[in-house]
């Protein structure tokens, strides 16, 4: 058993690179990384996705992209990525590192994820060895990282298969480590040269300071110039720690993503690692074997690097890798003012009072199937219903017998009489009208409006609301 550890040192535009990817985001962003380990170096052995394990980093610091400014290295998450392995460390493996960007804008559906870069590296690595440094190009991006595999006690050895247990664990004091295989003692780790960079240097013998790839100097504090040191051929320069370029079409290694360059007459040819293709291995050929579909997505096609894959996403997710959650509530599925709740596995509508159904589509207050009693008529409006009751009845459903005189409808002392068709007001002297609301002038001229055609003043008048009236 043991742990594979990956330390990302930097991620940013490569020399001469002008990646467009980071400038497509609309708001603040942050990076995170996914590491995937596959056993073996051969095409066949690499078939299974992440069989040795995978890990996701924490999110990095939030940054805001500025399209006008030159792109700096992007801020990274803190800490190591650790992939525990239970069994023996295989020694040969494929390392896949994906750089993801999370957009934190207020877009629908919460943060959106997009894959910025993917690098693949086939390596031989013994467990318990020093950090191995690497610089990889992915399109216009450059990723600098170091990695190692270490055994977890009591496992030791290059494959973490040998066990080492001192008889008395207490004999190994602070700063000491358990015995070498098959021996019963404790040994101190080597002490590196004083001042040796903790981040970029390491030692296997006391007093030495060996640098991770990309760093130089006696204490590993000096970054190697990337523009002149990336994959160049030729003799080593002791002054810079860089390789002096030699002539040829493979100078500077035009093959991205770990591709190896071989010269052809007047040109070059890239041999691409699995998962990449194109003239310069710049095209990511992720296949279904890499398990690219997140959130329950089904990978369709893409059985080999020459055929593209498609992720069929479950409802609720979208994006080329089903990495983005859909805000299904943005489609406003809940009717009649219902509140939409996306529970992930299902959509729920919390309905306003008076409505029901999965989408609040049923109006409990509508007139369908609702009878107003005693000859009342159902009237809809404003998402509710009411009964317009026949005279002499009232209440929500016209079931209550109403006393039309209870509200004292007759003005100026008129007396109210209940009648089969409503009420009748007997007006006090000097007043007239359906509710005794009009005074009669002393000169005998009525203050009533002009009589409707066909009616003479003084005739009993029937008003549109069908209440009889008498004037005295």
């Amino acid at each position: 058993a043991g742990v594979f550890e990956l330390q990302i040192h930097s991620f940013g535009p490569g020399p001469g690179g002008a990646p467009r990817s980071p400038y497509s985001a609309r708001g603040p962003c942050r990076l995170f990384f996914r590491v995937c380990l596959k056993p073996g170096l051969s095409e066949e052995a690499a078939e299974s996705p992440c069989a040795l394990g995978a890990a996701l980093s924490a999110r990095g610091p939030v940054y805001t992209e500025q399209p006008e400014a030159p792109a700096p290295d992007l801020p990274l998450p803190n800490g190591l990525l650790q992939v525990p392995f239970r069994d023996a460390w295989p020694g040969t493996f494929s390392l896949i590192i994906e750089t993801w960007r999370e957009e934190l804008g207020d877009q629908i559906g919460g943060p959106a994820w997009s894959l910025l870069a993917r690098v693949t590296r086939r390596r031989r690595l013994a467990a318990g060895g020093p950090w191995a440094g690497d610089i990889q190009r992915a399109g216009a991006w450059e990723l600098r990282f170091s990695y190692r595999a270490r055994c977890e006690l009591p496992a030791v050895g290059t494959a973490c298969t040998r066990l080492c247990r001192p008889r008395s664990a207490s004999r190994c004091g602070p700063g000491l480590r358990p015995c070498a295989p098959l021996e019963d003692e404790c040994e101190a780790p080597p002490v590196c040269r004083a001042g040796c960079s903790l981040e970029h240097g390491f030692c296997e013998q006391p007093g030495e300071c060996r640098c991770l790839e990309g760093w130089t100097g006696p204490l590993c504090m000096v970054p190697v110039s990337t523009s002149s040191c990336l994959g160049l051929r030729g003799p080593s320069s002791t002054t810079t720690g860089c390789l002096v370029p030699g002539p040829g079409p493979c100078d500077g290694n035009p093959c991205a993503n770990g591709g190896s360059c071989s010269e052809t007459p007047g040109s070059f040819e890239c041999t691409c690692p699995r998962g990449f293709y194109g003239l310069r291995c710049e095209v990511s050929g992720v296949t279904c074997a890499d398990g690219p579909c997140f959130n329950g997505g089904l990978c369709v096609g893409g059985a080999d690097p020459d055929s593209a894959y498609i992720c069929h996403c479950p409802p609720g997710f979208q994006g080329s890798n089903c990495e983005k959650r859909v805000d299904r509530c943005s489609l406003q599925p809940c009717r009649n003012g219902g509140l939409c709740l996306d529970l992930g596995h299902a959509l729920r509508c919390r309905c306003r009072a008076g409505f029901a159904g999965p989408r609040c589509e049923h109006d409990l207050n509508d007139c369908a199937g609702r009878a107003c009693a005693n000859g009342g008529t159902c009237v809809e409006g404003g998402g509710a219903h009411r009964c317009s009751c026949a005279l002499g009845f009232g209440g929500r459903d016209c079931r209550e017998r109403a006393d039309p005189c209870a509200a004292r409808p007759c003005a100026h002392g008129g007396r109210c009489y209940a009648h089969f068709s409503g009420l009748v007001c007997a007006c006090a002297p000097g007043y007239m009208g359906a509710r005794c609301e009009f005074p009669v002038h002393p000169d005998g001229v009525s203050a009533l409006p002009a009589a409707p055609p066909g009616l003479r003043p003084g005739d009993p008048q029937r008003y549109p609301h069908h209440h009889h009236h008498h004037h005295h």
Epitope: S48, P49, C288, G296, L298, P314, G316, G344
Partner: antibody
Framework: QVQLQESGPGLVKPSETLSLTCTVS????????WSWIRQPPGKGLEWIGY???????NYNPSLKSRVTMSVDTSKNQFSLKLSSVTAADTAVYFC????????????WGQGTMVTFSS | EIVLTQSPGTLSLSPGERATLSCRAS???????LAWYQQKPGQAPRLLIY???SRATGIPDRFSGSGSGTEFTLTISRLEPEDFAVYYC?????????FGQGTRLEIK
């Protein structure tokens, strides 16, 4: 609760086209993917394909040339057509719902036995 | 396509015993996109486990799933009479969706 009901002929002549319909109750057909699976007598399960209301389909490559699926959202139904049938297509045909957290089948119809014989 | 091989083909046990059913995939199933179903004679299959280890709604806790990569296991901790049936595993990470050939669990 959600229910699925297969319907179609129980007997089809070889070389003809089998047409089956699955009627979905108590859930909107546009909220899930829907699938057909078959099981020959005494044998295991074989996935035929699935469809989404948007028109997205995915068929088993072994049957792809003969399969067509469609969906009718107004009737809350989806359908399977299997052409050029032979006796080897004799099976119980199930319709099923694909779950919303991955392509596993969380609700099944009771199945309909279809025999191909002249 | 991913081929799923179930073992044993038939398992004879008594009620109260523990049943362990195996499903091996020809390739790694990403993100443990594996499900288990129970089928009784004349009935449709019923989903028991999804995501290799998550119990479906209404499934008793005597059913449990485990495994990752290419090796998956369905365990029934204490067999009840109604548990005797045929069990299928299914992968849903890579199209075409495929099922195992089934394990028949019968009363000893």
């Amino acid at each position: 609760q959600v229910q699925l009901q297969e319907s179609g002929p129980g007997l089809v002549k070889p070389s003809e086209t089998l047409s089956l319909t699955c009627t979905v109750s108590n859930v909107s057909i546009s909220s899930y993917y829907w699938s057909w699976i078959r099981q020959p007598p005494g044998k295991g399960l074989e996935w035929i394909g699935y469809i989404y209301y948007s028109g997205t389909t995915n068929y088993n490559p072994s049957l792809k040339s003969r399969v067509t699926m469609s969906v009718d959202t107004s009737k809350n139904q989806f359908s399977l057509k299997l052409s050029s049938v032979t006796a080897a297509d004799t099976a119980v045909y199930f319709c099923a719902r694909l779950s919303n957290w991955g392509f596993a089948f969380d609700i099944w119809g009771q199945g309909t036995m279809v025999t191909f014989s002249s | 396509e991913i081929v799923l091989t179930q073992s044993p083909g038939t398992l004879s046990l008594s009620p109260g015993e523990r049943a362990t059913l195996s499903c091996r995939a020809s390739q790694t199933i990403s993100s443990s996109y594996l499900a288990w179903y129970q089928q009784k004679p004349g009935q449709a299959p019923r989903l028991l486990i999804y995501g290799a280890s998550s119990r479906a709604t209404g499934i008793p806790d005597r059913f449990s799933g485990s495994g990752s990569g290419t090796e998956f296991t369905l365990t029934i901790s204490r067999l009840e009479p109604e548990d005797f049936a045929v069990y299928y595993c299914q992968q849903y990470g890579w199209s075409p969706i495929t099922f195992g050939q089934g394990t028949r669990l019968e009363i000893k």
